[in-house]
C-alpha cells in the first residue's frame, strides 16, 4: 500500500550535469543546459516528485511527474520507461507499482540519488547514450557504483 504525502518541484540531473527534460515527443532525455536554458525550457525541465508513505518501509517511495499541457507520470511498465498521461494517485493498493520508485541516496553521498523500481527489484533509472541522445531508461544493474544510475535532485520550491 502506498499513500500520497507531499510533492515538490525538482530539476533532475545526471552526474555529467545534464538536465532531464521531456521532449516534444514525450520522451525523457538529458541535455547540456545552462541555468537560464533550464529556466527557459520550463515546465519541461521541472519534475513533480510526489512522496508516498509505504506500508513496507523500503526507502522513500516517489512518483515522478511533469506538467506540460496535462500531467504525465513516469512509468516503467514492462521495463520500458515512458510518461503516461495520468495524475499521481492518492493511494495505490499494492506493494509494487510501475509508477513508484524508491529514491535513496548513494551511501556516503547524500546529494547523489538512485531510483529503484518498486515493480522490478534490482532495476534502476539510468542515463544511457543511444546514438546522439542521452535517454532515461530502466536498467538492470548489479554494478551499484555505476555513475549512470546516479542523479542529483535540486528542489525548486
Amino acid at each position: 500500500y502506498f499513500g500520497k504525502l507531499e510533492s515538490k518541484l525538482s530539476v533532475i540531473r545526471n552526474l555529467n550535469d545534464q538536465v532531464l527534460f521531456i521532449d516534444q515527443g514525450n520522451r525523457p532525455l538529458f541535455e547540456d543546459m545552462t541555468d537560464s536554458d533550464c529556466r527557459d525550457n520550463a515546465p519541461r525541465t521541472i519534475f513533480i516528485i510526489s512522496m508516498y508513505k509505504d506500508s513496507q518501509p523500503r526507502g522513500m517511495a516517489v512518483t515522478i511527474s511533469v506538467k506540460c499541457e496535462k500531467i504525465s507520470t513516469l512509468s516503467c511498465e514492462n521495463k520500458i520507461i515512458s510518461f503516461k498521461e495520468m495524475n499521481p494517485p492518492d493511494n495505490i493498493k499494492d506493494t509494487k507499482s510501475d509508477i513508484i520508485f524508491f529514491q535513496r541516496s548513494v551511501p556516503g553521498h547524500d546529494n547523489k540519488m538512485q531510483f529503484e523500481s518498486s515493480s522490478y527489484e534490482g532495476y534502476f533509472l539510468a542515463c544511457e547514450k543511444e546514438r546522439d541522445l542521452f535517454k532515461l531508461i530502466l536498467k538492470k544493474e548489479d554494478e551499484l557504483g555505476d555513475r549512470s544510475i546516479m542523479f542529483t535532485v535540486q528542489n525548486e520550491d
Epitope: P57, R58, G59, F102, R104, V106, P107, G108, H109, E116, E121, G122, K140, D142, E143, L144, G145, D146
Partner: antibody, heavy 126, light 107 residues
C-alpha cells in the same frame, strides 16, 4: 537454504579446456547472478566473471575474457564455467557463488556473494 | 580497475586480542564492500556487507566500518575459530576486486 554443488576435481594437460558445473539446490529467489572466483595455491581470491541467468549476459575479468565462457541452464538450475588454453598457472580451486541483493534497514541495496560452492580443484600438469 | 590494498598481509595474535584489518580502495566505492573469512579447504564465508552490516549468524565480535576509500574489519576479542584468512571485496564496479588477503595466525 540455498546450496551450490560443484562438479569434481579435474586433472588437465596444458592447452586443454575444463568445464566446471555448479548446481543450485534449495529455494532461490529471482534476481541473482552467478559469479566465479578462483584461488591459486599460495595466492588470494581472484574474480573471474559473472553471468545473469535472466538473459545470459556476462561480464568477465579482462585477464580471462579470451579464454573463459560462462553459461547457465535454467531448466536444471546449473551454471557452467569453461576455461580454455589451460596452463600450469591455472591450477587452482574454482568456486561458484551467488550474487544477490541484501538490504539495510532503509531498503538500500547491496550485492553480496552469499552462497558458495564447495570448490573444484583443477590441476594443470603435463 | 579499482585496486584494493589490504593490510597487513599477515598478523600473529593471541586468543582475546583485538585485531584490525584495513582495505584501501583506489577510488570511492560507496560502502559497496564485503568482508569474507576463508579457512583452509573451505569456501569463503560472508561476514560483513555494506561495509558495516553484520551477516546473520556472524558473531558480534566482528565489526566493519569505513566509507569512501578506507575500510576496516575489527575482531574485538579473538576466538580460536577466528584464525583464518580474511578478504575484502569491492562490489561497486566491474571488474570486482578482492584485497590480497590477511592471514591471521596464532602467536
Amino acid at each position: 537454504q540455498v546450496q551450490l554443488v560443484q562438479s569434481g576435481a579435474e586433472v588437465k594437460k596444458p592447452g586443454a579446456s575444463v568445464k566446471v558445473s555448479c548446481k543450485v539446490s534449495g529455494e532461490i529467489s529471482t534476481g541473482y547472478y552467478f559469479h566465479w572466483v578462483r584461488r591459486r595455491p599460495g595466492k588470494g581470491l581472484e574474480w573471474m566473471g559473472r553471468i545473469d541467468p535472466e538473459d545470459d549476459s556476462t561480464k568477465y575479468a579482462e585477464r580471462f575474457k579470451d579464454r573463459v565462457t560462462m553459461t547457465e541452464d535454467t531448466s536444471t538450475d546449473t551454471a557452467y564455467m569453461e576455461l580454455s588454453s589451460l596452463r600450469s598457472e591455472d591450477t587452482a580451486v574454482y568456486y561458484c557463488t551467488t550474487w544477490r541483493i541484501y538490504r539495510d534497514s532503509s531498503g538500500r541495496p547491496f550485492y553480496v556473494m552469499d552462497a558458495w560452492g564447495q570448490g573444484t580443484l583443477v590441476t594443470v600438469s603435463s | 580497475d579499482i585496486q584494493m590494498t589490504q593490510s597487513p598481509s599477515s598478523v600473529s595474535a593471541s586468543v582475546g586480542d583485538r585485531v584490525t584489518i584495513t582495505c584501501l580502495a583506489s577510488e570511492d566505492i560507496y560502502t559497496y564492500l564485503t568482508w569474507y573469512q576463508q579457512k583452509p579447504g573451505k569456501a569463503p564465508k560472508l561476514l560483513i556487507y555494506g561495509a558495516n552490516k553484520l551477516q546473520d549468524g556472524v558473531p558480534s565480535r566482528f565489526s566493519g566500518s569505513g566509507s569512501g576509500t578506507d575500510y576496516t574489519l575489527t575482531i574485538s576479542s579473538l576466538q580460536p575459530e577466528d584464525f583464518a584468512t580474511y578478504y575484502c571485496l569491492q562490489g561497486s564496479k566491474f571488474p570486482l576486486t578482492f584485497g590480497q588477503g590477511t592471514k591471521l595466525e596464532i602467536k
